[in-house]
């Protein structure tokens, strides 16, 4: 039997043991989150698989993920949404020590897909473990990119109260209009539900005492948000390591002064 021709993409292939990983993560998540115990993980996997299997991986749509999104419906309490841009690790470290706040990856669907890659092939039931489309070199409508665009949109749409966003103050563009936050989440916050967006600009340098809230890209973000009738606030976090320590234990003597 001749080996069937397989499309070669520029990106890395599906993460090994992808189906097992998704299923195992789903089981683990629903075990520790009572509000999601009703979720049937096999159905979740079937819906996930159904979004990309047998489909041309450069022609995936948000509609393909709707059955999965429906199964993973989850609400975040008002004032507890934490968005992030280019600073994922610190955002996740923060929600580990301040467990009442939620990033997208603390929600079921984000948790399932975090750091994974996947794609299928047109007209076969196989998963492509060799290569998957790269967003820049191949196409933007690939399974992974469309997934994150879909769930990011939904996460932003359902946010309420004061929404927080962690931004990387070490980048040339602290706010980047082309990031998922800048291109999707900002535009899907609902003014009738969201009172304000509070940006936390995380400083990289230990001796960096500049007010990065005055950065032109932050002013651009403020303008976009204000035009959407959402109030905007910005705060500098000069020492992220110290910040995490003090979030964990605010009564520590070194945290009681206004450092």
């Amino acid at each position: 039997v001749l080996p069937r021709w397989r499309q070669q993409w520029s990106g890395s292939g599906t993460t090994s043991r992808f189906p097992e990983t998704v299923l195992a993560r789903c089981v683990k998540y629903t075990e520790v989150h009572p509000e999601m115990r009703h979720v049937d993980c096999q159905s979740v996997w079937d819906a996930f698989k159904g979004a990309f299997i047998s489909k041309y991986p450069c022609n995936i749509t948000e509609e393909d993920y709707q059955p999965l999104v429906k199964l993973g419906t989850q609400t975040v309490p008002c004032n507890k949404t934490l968005l992030w841009s280019r600073i994922k690790d610190l955002a996740h470290q923060f929600t580990q020590v301040q467990r009442d706040m939620f990033t997208l990856e603390d929600m079921l669907l984000g948790y399932l897909a975090d750091d994974l890659t996947w794609c299928g092939e047109f007209n076969t039931f196989e998963i492509n473990y060799q290569s998957c489309p790269d967003w820049r070199k191949d196409c933007s409508n690939n399974p992974v990119s469309v997934f994150w665009k879909t769930v990011s949109r939904r996460f932003a749409e359902t946010a309420c109260g004061v929404v927080h966003v962690m931004l990387n103050g070490s980048r040339s563009k602290i706010f980047d209009k082309n990031s998922t936050f800048g291109s999707v989440e900002v535009h899907n916050l609902q003014p009738e539900k969201v009172q304000a967006l509070e940006a936390w600009v995380i400083h990289g340098g230990r001796e960096d005492s500049r007010d990065l809230c005055q950065d032109p890209t932050i002013k651009e973000l403020e303008s976009i948000i204000s035009k959407r009738n959402i109030r905007f606030f910005c705060k500098n976090i000069y020492r992220p390591d110290k910040f995490l320590q003090c979030v964990k234990n605010p009564e520590d003597s070194s945290c009681l002064s206004g450092i």
Epitope: H33, P34, T75, P77, R99, D100, Y238, F243, V247, P250
Partner: antibody, heavy 127, light 108 residues
């Protein structure tokens, strides 16, 4: 010194009404989320109601929903609970408590605890 | 609405270490706090955020959390520790406080 002082307790007949007050001292009352907790004679603590710092969000225990109303007057640093249609089982010492919140490097965080309690005021519902 | 279950009573002798447990259907994201109520007084916060001690609370008191259970340990037991101890958690999804039934600590 951070302090909470309750008042307004007393004897009331079943079906009657009473309003309890709690005044805060020594902290920025406007910033504080507040709660009412009660304790029936010889029993444990039971949460009654909770109110956000500006009074825009209120939450109630099922046992008092529709009968009790929590409110606040930030200009007077005072928390209230209006208790209507009182029943014998509402007899208790009523405590007001401040929700523990801290500013960590200008970021305000909720620590899900009640860090300051009043001395309590006794409500007796009896005919 | 979840219910927190505490052992009704525990006892110990001065200098001993006692542990009070609190179990229930916690969401992983809900924090546990502990309160001490001395006879005839208002409750006092002992532990917040599962294992953190407010300033002024002696380090003889410690909290821990493992999944669906939390516990309060008191080491070097003293006669003035005789009191009722309550665990509590704010349910961030239901927006309600849930208290345990309380544990009476007797120092023999």
């Amino acid at each position: 010194e951070v302090q909470l002082l309750e008042s307004g307790g007393g004897l009331v007949q079943p079906g009657g009404s009473l309003r309890l007050s709690c005044t805060g001292f020594g902290f920025t009352f406007t910033d504080a989320r507040m709660s009412w907790v009660r304790q029936a004679p010889g029993k444990g603590l039971e949460w009654v109601a909770d109110i956000s710092s500006y009074g825009d969000n209120t939450y109630y225990a099922d046992s008092v929903k529709g009968r009790f109303t929590i409110s606040r007057d930030n200009s007077a640093n005072t928390l209230y609970v209006q208790m209507n249609s009182l029943r014998a089982e509402d007899t208790a010492v009523y405590y007001c408590a401040k929700r523990m919140e801290r500013e960590v490097m200008t970021i305000k965080l909720d620590y899900h605890a009640m860090d300051v309690w009043g001395q309590g005021t006794t409500v007796t519902v009896s005919s | 609405q979840s219910v927190l279950t505490q052992t009704p009573s525990v006892s110990g002798t001065p200098g001993q270490r006692v542990t009070i447990s609190c179990s229930g259907v916690f969401n992983i994201r809900n924090y546990v706090s502990w309160y001490q109520q001395l006879p005839g007084t208002a409750p006092k916060l002992l532990i917040f955020k599962d294992d953190q001690r407010p300033s002024g609370v002696p380090d003889r008191f410690s909290g821990s959390r493992s999944g669906t259970s939390a516990s309060l340990a008191i080491s070097g037991l003293q006669s003035e520790d005789e009191a009722d101890y309550y665990c509590a958690a704010w349910d961030i999804f239901l927006n309600v406080w849930v208290f345990g039934g309380g544990t009476k600590l007797t120092v023999l």
